[in-house]
């Protein structure tokens, strides 16, 4: 039938950061190609990445339609050059992915400190509100737009001259912290979704220190 050497995909894995979402699987194809289908629990199957020799498929366009839905994908295997051929049961071989709920599971990308400004003994640290691929009314939403108050940021800061660290939290994208006059400080931030049980925290942002061009100092 031409399907003898066709193998089902396995190790189907969702890789998702800030809603950019790719399904990956194995094995690398030998004399076969793949097609991916995705649906919500209650929806119809939609085909993507037709007859591909890749072992990944970007499903971002589908999941951003409703990031709070739960999605299921499946990967079909076909003999190369004979994609009409089916398995012994009259169906092409396929394997299901784990379920995936983007809002609960997408990884939080590494945040970036946009700026910091010192006014006297206060420093305002601003975290960049990263744009996602989630759309509303033809506009791309930011991470804050999507998560609202479910998203907090943790700031770590310390004097350049010392190892003692302090921390602060915000449910906006700004911190206003007290500092000692005449001291330089370094900053790093982390995104957190406290209500989650998995993928709760991002990696730390790159460290930014006062005295570098990103910040601004004003003596009032």
């Amino acid at each position: 039938s031409g399907t003898t050497n066709t193998v089902a995909a396995y190790n189907l894995t969702w890789k998702s950061t800030n809603f950019k979402t790719i399904l990956e699987w194995e094995p690398k194809p030998v004399n076969q190609v793949y097609t991916v289908q995705i649906s919500t629990k209650s929806g119809d199957w939609k085909s993507k990445c037709f007859y591909t020799t890749d072992t990944e498929c970007d499903l971002t366009d589908e999941i951003v339609k409703d990031v709070k839905q739960t999605y299921l994908a499946r990967v079909f295997s076909y003999p190369a050059g004979n994609v009409e051929s089916t398995g012994s049961a009259g169906e092409p071989l396929y394997e299901n992915s784990p379920e995936f709920t983007p809002y609960l599971e997408t990884n939080l990308g590494q945040p970036t400190i946009q700026s910091f400004e010192q006014v006297g003994t206060k420093v305002n640290v601003t975290v960049e509100d990263e744009r996602t691929l989630v759309r509303r009314n033809n506009t791309f939403l930011s991470l804050r737009d999507v998560f609202g108050k479910d998203l907090i940021y943790t700031l770590y800061y310390w004097k350049s001259s010392s190892s003692g660290k302090k921390t602060a939290k915000t449910n906006t994208n700004e911190f206003l912290i007290d500092v000692d006059k005449g001291e330089n400080y370094c900053f790093s931030v982390q995104a957190v979704i406290p209500s989650r049980t998995v993928n709760r925290k991002s990696t730390d942002s790159p460290v930014e220190c006062m005295g570098q061009e990103k910040g601004e100092f004003r003596e009032i």
Epitope: I152, T154, Y156, K165, K166, T167, A168, K169, T170, N171, T172, I177, Q190, V192, I193, P194, S195, T197, V198, R200, K201, T203, D204
Partner: antibody, heavy 117, light 107 residues
């Protein structure tokens, strides 16, 4: 289910150190923050410090800075608190607690540290 | 450092009474405030997180309100098992600070 199991009671001499462990189960400490709080007999709760096991950042109340070290071993899912130069005023129950970002939502059973000569 | 002023330090009440405990922060803590109940010989137990959210398994007679610097814990109808000491905690900025506690006793 989530549990924090602390090491047993300690009797220590003034000037020595004590290291208390807090073994977590039911969650990965790397996904949370771990804190230490103490309560002297008949007194209120006092924050000692905390640690982010994912990146090693530790924060301390200035009152304890230089005397306390908070660490975590992610391979064993265990948080630690070491307090040095002990004095009689350090006699207290020491609690570890998990910080979700919204609250310290789970607490250990407490470890009684008695400092006496 | 942020100071937390909790009041009253103690109160006497009867079963069925409505009880209110307040915590005032020395600066805006952006709702990073939680409330705990502690009984003698036991670890503190979380009641309210993020100022207003009820923790899992906590009876609905407990509620939290407030924002900015002023926060309140209310017990709508005091039950026998509610006689205990209550603490607020600000965790918006280190060093984290607890209120001094409120001991709720039987009248």
């Amino acid at each position: 289910q989530v549990q924090l199991l602390e090491s047993g009671a300690v009797l220590a001499r003034p000037g020595t150190s004590v290291k208390i462990s807090c073994k977590a189960s039911g969650f990965n400490i790397k996904d949370y923050y771990m804190h230490w709080v103490r309560q002297a007999p008949g007194q209120g709760l006092e924050w000692i410090g905390g640690n982010d096991p994912a990146n090693g950042h530790s924060m301390y109340d200035p009152k304890f800075q230089g005397r306390v070290t908070i660490t975590a071993d992610t391979s064993t899912n265990t948080a630690y608190m070491e307090l040095s130069s002990l004095r009689s005023e350090d006699t207290a129950i020491y609690y570890c607690a998990r910080d979700s970002g919204y609250a310290m939502d789970y607490w250990g059973q407490g470890t009684l540290v008695t400092v006496s000569s | 450092d942020i100071q937390m002023t909790q009041s009253p330090s103690s109160l006497s009440a009867s079963v069925g009474d409505r009880v209110t405990i307040t915590c005032k922060a020395s600066q805006d803590i952006k709702s990073f405030l939680s409330w705990y109940q502690q009984k003698p010989g036991k670890a503190p137990k979380l009641l309210i997180y993020y100022a207003t959210s009820l923790a899992d398994g906590v009876p609905s007679r407990f509620s939290g309100s407030g924002s900015g610097t002023d926060y309140t814990l209310t017990i709508s109808s005091l039950q026998p098992e509610d006689f205990a000491t209550y603490y607020c905690l600000q965790h918006g900025e280190s060093p984290y600070t607890f209120g001094g506690g409120t001991k709720v006793e039987i009248k």
